[in-house]
Interface confidence: medium
Amino acid sequence: PEPPTACREKQYLINSQCCSLCQPGQKLVSDCTEFTETECLPCGESEFLDTWNRETHCHQHKYCDPNLGLRVQQKGTSETDTICTCEEGWHCTSEACESCVLHRSCSPGFGVKQIATGVSDTICEPCPVGFFSNVSSAFEKCHPWTSCETKDLVVQQAGTNKTDVVCGPQDRLRA
């Protein structure tokens, strides 16, 4: 019979012969012959192959390096790679999440509009009139000025976007 020029799905052509590919999670040890099946072996600990393949080496699982702010989101198996994500308070620097950075701080005069997530940075907003922030923070919102009136006090010093109002006693009318 004519040697095949193409093979079925999950097979590969070698030495004019169709051999079975190794299933996900296994690597190739030896090609099939006229008399023997393809020989495959499971990937070792911390290794994987995620496709039907003829690879002679499994891929190493991704390492989620804590020195880069990374942690394991999903542990790898013999068929899947490890998925890394950022620790709380950090976010990925790229879609592949190869490293993380701390969330950006909002400077005094600005407050946090939206706390960062694992994939997006802090969104800051200027403190509007009546609000202030005197801190550099990735978490704190603008705070409302103190209401002197509710304390039976008067405004001695106006507030700004960076400072609270200063309240003081009301001047007593002299008789």
Epitope: L68, G69, V101, R104, S105, V135, S136, S137, A138, F139
Partner: nanobody, 121 residues
Framework: EVQLLESGGGLVQPGGSLRLSCAAS????????MQWVRQAPGKGLEWVST????????YYADSVKGRFTTSRDNSKNTLYLQMNSLRAEDTAVYYC??????????????WGQGTLVTVSS
């Protein structure tokens, strides 16, 4: 001049507790988020925890979550790290650091000199 001075480290048995302190001076302590980071022998820096300027928000690394608690006393310009259920892998030099505007782990604004925590039986 910004200064951060850690204290409270020492030798403790597995399962034990320690409380670290970080005394801050030279800047408006209450105006900044703060961090704890650590460096195990022969390893790189590892982030441990972040606390917001007011102390309302705290974040922890998975490796210490549920065992460590970060707090601060802005009236005393002091940051704390309460460490419970200590494990051998918690052995490290612990540093407090002022949260910068932007950085990677080797680029904190200001560091303390660190305090060594050794967990061993």
């Amino acid at each position: 001049e910004v200064q951060l001075l850690e204290s409270g480290g020492g030798l403790v048995q597995p399962g034990g507790s320690l409380r670290l302190s970080c005394a801050a001076s030279g800047f408006t302590f209450s105006g900044y988020d703060m961090q704890w980071v650590r460096q195990a022998p022969g390893k790189g820096l590892e982030w441990v925890s972040t606390i917001s300027a007011s102390g309302v928000f705290t974040y922890y690394a998975d490796s210490v979550k549920g065992r460590f608690t970060t707090s601060r006393d802005n009236s005393k310009n002091t940051l704390y790290l309460q460490m419970n259920s200590l494990r051998a892998e918690d052995t490290a030099v612990y540093y407090c650091a002022k949260y910068p505007n932007r950085f990677a782990l080797n680029n904190f604004d200001y560091w303390g000199q660190g305090t060594l925590v050794t967990v061993s039986s």
